[in-house]
């Protein structure tokens, strides 16, 4: 919520150090609550760096004040079950952007460490931590990724319809009737099959789907040269401007697209979101995650970060675990079980790597002689006579559509249906009115049409 000088702690300083504009980054590190491992320094439960980073503009002589922090969440994905007890480490890093006092620099301003006890699914917990002359106000919570539920996120929820104590719109889980499915945090109406969210009220689309609620299939076509399919009958369109167009990375940095934004891989000696920061030395503490800084005694000589296991990047800023290669397809969640990896698939997908699309004809056959028909990015079964339902597993009720006209009674039969017609009507569907004078039967007029309307009998 805010970061700044604590009350009554000597001469108040500003996080920007009165050196002009600066940015604050927050690195969150989760460790096991009780760790017997020698790898005490590793963030074994997970780590993340803040991404919503505004520039704070401040000038020498201004009175110091706490800086309001942006609302952007710092999401730390944790692997396996949530332990409940954990150590929370929050580092506050300053990136100085001004030209005063030697130019840009990175500094670790504060590092707060504390043991916490927290069940997943609970409300936000507020906290204030002081370290040295700094004070950090923040909130934190633990949340399970569906379909995991429970205080430890260790149970997988298969929702079922049944009377329960669950809140409105939430259903109990099979086989844990006392557990309720996790409430949806996505934008209302976001497609559960083709959309997902990482933050409340957003809706991100899986490959092949688009639209604000991910309900519009992206039409495929034979467009060549990486052109994208255009609207019907317009051929192909050139892709719109991408985040890397014009290469926003300075100083020889290489740009890669990451979910609608971009990421710069900076050459040694440069840092910042666009590799715009230079002249960094080891004294500025540029190596994250316990990386060892070597060289770089002065701004002209490049430093090198030697990263601890599990981290890479020119500043050890990227966590590299065995899930980094993204083995799970179609938005599946990768879990490292120690001896191997496993994928937790999103709804509508199955297989060890979530590679089978259950909404795809290749994924599952239609029963009882039904045929699978694909279209619009989904599949449906066209069922044989006498069968119905999504997979043609249900015996169809031939009388459900009330096929017998004029009050005729319908009887289901092994070969279809039989109509017992009301007096004065005849035909397979009781569609003919019987003339009392013995003349030929004529189709009975539907209600609202006169018997003699010519357009009815052309």
């Amino acid at each position: 919520h805010s970061f700044g000088p604590g009350p009554g702690l000597g001469t108040p300083r500003s996080p920007c150090n009165a050196r002009g504009p600066c940015r604050l980054f927050f690195r969150v590190c989760l460790k096991p609550g009780v760790s017997q491992e020698a790898t005490e320094s590793l963030c074994a439960l997970g780590a993340a760096l803040s991404t919503s980073v505004p520039v704070y503009t401040e000038h020498p002589g201004e009175s110091a004040a706490a800086l309001p922090l942006p609302d952007g969440l710092v999401r730390v994905p944790f692997r396996d079950a949530w332990p409940g007890t954990f150590s929370l480490v929050i580092e506050t890093w300053r990136e100085q952007l001004g030209e005063h006092a030697g130019g840009p620099a990175w500094n670790l301003l504060a590092r707060v460490v504390g043991r916490r006890r927290l069940a997943a699914g609970g409300p936000w917990a507020r906290d204030v931590q002081r370290t040295g002359t700094w004070e950090l106000h923040f909130s934190y919570r633990a949340r399970c990724e569906p379909p995991a539920v429970g205080a430890a996120c260790a149970r997988l929820c298969r929702s079922r319809s049944a009377p329960s104590r669950c809140g409105p719109g939430l259903r109990p889980c099979t086989p844990f009737p006392d557990e309720c499915e996790a409430p949806s945090v996505c934008r209302p109406g976001c497609s559960p099959e083709h959309g997902y969210c990482e933050e409340p009220d957003e809706c991100r689309c899986l490959e092949g789907w688009t639209g604000p609620l991910c309900t519009v299939p992206v039409s495929t076509s034979s467009c060549l040269n990486s052109r994208v399919p255009g609207p019907a009958s317009t051929g192909c369109l050139l892709p719109g401007p991408g985040p890397c167009d014009g290469n926003p990375c300075a100083n020889g940095g290489s740009c890669s697209e990451t979910s609608g934004s971009f990421e710069c891989a900076c050459p040694r000696g440069f840092y910042g979101l666009r590799c715009e920061v230079s002249g960094v030395t080891c004294a500025d503490g540029p190596c994250f995650n316990g990386g060892l800084c070597v060289g770089g005694e002065d701004p002209d000589s490049a430093y090198v970060c030697h990263c601890p296991p599990g981290f890479q990047g020119s500043n050890c800023e990227k966590r590299v675990d065995r899930c980094s290669l993204q083995p799970c397809q179609n938005g599946g969640l990768c879990l490292d079980l120690g001896h191997a990896l496993r994928c937790r698939c999103r709804a509508g997908f199955a297989g060890p790597r979530c590679e089978h699309d259950l909404d795809d004809c290749a994924g599952r056959a239609c029963a009882n002689g039904g045929t699978c028909v694909e279209g619009g990015g989904s599949r449906r079964c066209s069922c044989a006579l006498g069968f119905g339902g999504r997979d043609c597993r249900e015996r169809a009720d031939p009388c459900a559509s009330r096929p017998c006209a004029h009050g005729g009674r319908c009887y289901a039969h092994f070969s279809g249906l039989v109509c017992a017609c009301a007096p004065g009507y005849m035909g397979v569907r009781c569609e003919f009115a019987v003339r009392p004078d013995g003349a030929d039967a004529v189709p009975a007029a539907p209600r609202g049409l006169r018997q003699a309307d010519p357009q009815r009998f052309l």
Epitope: P309, G310, R322, S324, H339, A340, L341, R353, E355
Partner: antibody, heavy 120, light 107 residues
Amino acid sequence: EVQLVQSGSELKKPGASVKVSCKASGYTFTDYYMNWVRQAPGQGLEWMGIINPYSGVTIYNHKFKGRFALSVDKSSNTAYLQISSLKAEDTAVYYCARQDSLLDYAMDYWGQGTTVTVSS
Amino acid sequence: DIQMTQSPSSLSASVGDRVTITCHASQGISGNMGWLQQKPGKAPKGLIYHGANLEEGVPSRFSGSGSGADYTLTISSLQPEDFADYYCVQYAQFPYTFGGGTKVEIK
């Protein structure tokens, strides 16, 4: 039958580039990562990097960052290793080796190796 | 990076001998390691995965054991075709690393 067939030997001059291919058959290409391993003459094995053919995501040994690039062509079930600005010390046998993407197995099948000689 | 220290670097043995090669990791790797065999001029071949599981088609005289940071490859009765170089490899963490190798020679 699972097979990884690599391209033939290459003789290159320093500063040139080389692209080594590894064609996979007998299994679902996108279900297995492809590792690349280097063996200099008379030396042991050195892991260079790994690529997920499904997503194209790569991870490199920091020793092999910069001049070395891994890629795949899913349509032909082929993985590639490209080395640019060749140096004499790049002279080695380069192997591709598949690995189950859920890490249930180690590097079970290997290509026959491609000898790259860099000499002026 | 995880260091894999393999010993011995070479050994001489006779047909029928029991041979043991060890590999020590610089930190625990939870069984995420394998053993490879390489004959002169040939590509390596997988023998053992997950510390103790035999790859398909590998004779049962080969066995692997160990946990934590220490692992062993045993050849219960050495055969003429077993004279080769043997390597351990860890895949617990990137970058993967190999042991220095053990050359098994005829006595």
